[in-house]
């Protein structure tokens, strides 16, 4: 039961995470105009991975797509790539994990196959989450660098009569969505990997059995022999010898923590 719960929870957490990664990638507010210590402009600028927007105080909003590929900064392209790779891996992971779910029966799929699929999807979720976290972090680093550069510019060349409003950008909502979503996908992936251990049929599945020889109270414990060693072993037959194959409830699931920003 614990394996099913861990796997199911891992799937749900990953699903939420990947939905968040998709949302963050599509959001326009990756960077927003910094309003602190600025003259109050009646125009608010914000930028996403795909377009930049201007919201006037009148309520009118105008967005323009980045209609160039070569003219964009390499870092922005890298962030786009990381987010897309994260989404693609996550989507494939979700597809694989649906078939790997213990509660879903597809034909005569063996536990070992489900275990492998669970592990595969878990790894995919982990990589997907890492891609999203990396993408968001690269963008955040780019913002911090540009912020301090523009701050330095604000305090140079102010000697003239005419002043220009230096637009500085700070973290937008999409960054926080991306970090949380990446973290959730990562946690979901770890949970899937943990669940995989409980799904995998183990090589030695016997509990100690006591054989009472007449007149002696000596307990013999079967050592290192296997239930079936031949090729094409039928795991279904193992149940005959299985005095206590680990039940789903006995699998240990480790509590995981994530910080919500």
């Amino acid at each position: 039961m614990a394996v099913t719960a861990c796997q199911g929870l891992g799937f749900v957490v990953s699903l939420i995470g990947i939905a968040g990664i998709i949302a963050a990638t599509c959001m326009d507010q990756w960077s927003t105009q910094d309003l602190y210590n600025n003259p109050v402009t009646a125009v608010f600028n914000y930028q996403g991975l795909w377009r930049s927007c201007v919201r006037e105080s009148s309520g009118f909003t105008e967005c323009r797509g980045y209609f160039t590929l070569l003219g964009l900064p390499a870092m922005l392209q890298a962030v786009r790539a990381l987010m897309i790779v994260g989404i693609v891996l996550g989507a494939i992971g979700l597809l694989v994990s649906i078939f790997a779910l213990k509660c879903i029966r597809i034909g005569s799929m063996e536990d070992s196959a489900k275990a492998n699929m669970t592990l595969t999807s878990g790894i995919m979720f982990i990589v997907s989450g890492l891609c999203a976290i990396a993408g968001v972090s690269v963008f955040a680093n780019m913002l911090v660098t540009n912020f301090w550069m523009s701050t330095a510019n604000m305090y140079t060349g102010m000697g003239g009569m005419v002043q220009t409003v230096q637009t500085r950008y700070t973290f937008g909502a999409a960054l926080f969505v991306g970090w949380v979503a990446g973290g959730l996908t990562l946690i979901g992936g770890v949970m899937m990997c943990i669940a995989c251990r409980g799904l995998a049929p183990e090589e030695t599945n016997y509990k100690a059995v006591s054989y009472h020889a007449s007149g002696h109270s000596v307990a013999y414990k079967p050592g290192g022999f296997k239930a079936s060693t031949g090729f094409g072993s039928n795991t279904k037959n193992k149940k005959i010898y299985d005095g206590g194959a680990r039940t789903e409830d006995e699998v240990q699931s480790y509590p995981s923590k994530h910080d919500y920003v």
């Epitope: 125009v43 930028q47 002043q163 409003v165 637009t167």
Partner: antibody, heavy 118, light 113 residues
């Protein structure tokens, strides 16, 4: 047809307060901010502030904070401006104007003449 | 507050003449993100409320004759009336629409000979 109909001229005593109304028709009232502008006799225009009728958010010109209070009544599509502690300096024509793209003001009320005199 | 300086304060022209009205801002009204200058021009005829002519420096409001054109960027702006008509007798105001509080120029009074 879009119209901003303002209340009639007011003659008030110094120290009192007055509430000017601006009834909007011909468009979605909550979809556009309403601005208020002061024009003293023979002088230029002065922006007082604006209000978002949907959320009732306000922006004031620092010079008019404490002097003007902007409110709206969504049910009657009417914007109000209350002017407090009136002095002769407040004698002017007050306009309401709709806020549109470019942060410009496309439709204006006909103006309300306020005269503060003892 | 951003001071908007208009010049000249008044001018008298004959019908058919070309007129230019200047407006200077103490601070740039240019928004780099959408490459637009947040400056509007208004026309106020005697006894009437102001009427919007141009916004974003050069975008003509619907119903405004083509003889009214706007130009400039950053801090220097110009309103041009290519061929003045008798009905253009009015006071023209420029307005900063970029930084709060929105401020207007002192106005340019156009008179027809």
């Amino acid at each position: 047809e879009i119209q901003l109909q303002q209340s009639g001229a007011e003659l008030v005593k110094p120290g009192t307060s007055v509430k000017i109304s601006c009834k909007a028709s011909g468009y979605s009232f909550t979809g556009y901010n309403m601005n208020w502008v002061k024009q003293s006799h023979g002088k230029s225009l002065e922006w007082i502030g604006n209000i978002n009728p949907y959320y009732s958010n306000t922006n004031y010109n620092q010079r008019f904070k404490g002097k003007a209070t902007l409110t709206v009544d969504k049910s009657s599509s009417t914007a109000y401006m209350q002017l407090n502690s009136l002095t002769s300096e407040d004698s002017a024509v007050y306009y309401c104007a709709r806020h549109v793209r470019g942060n410009s003001f496309d439709y204006w009320g006909q103006g309300t003449t306020l005269t503060v005199s003892s | 507050d951003i001071v908007m300086t208009q010049s000249p304060s008044s001018l008298t022209v004959t019908a058919g003449e070309r007129v230019t009205v200047g407006c200077k801002s103490r601070q740039s009204l240019f928004n780099s993100e959408n490459q637009k200058n947040y400056l509007s021009w208004y026309q106020q005829k005697p006894g009437q409320p102001p009427k919007l002519l141009l916004y974003w420096t050069s975008t003509r409001e619907s119903g405004v004759p083509e003889r009214f054109t706007g130009s400039g960027s950053g801090t220097d702006f110009t309103l041009t009336i290519s061929s003045v008509q008798a009905e253009d007798l009015a006071v023209y105001y420029c307005q900063n629409n970029y930084i709060y509080p929105f401020t207007f120029g002192s106005g340019t009074k156009l008179e027809i000979k």
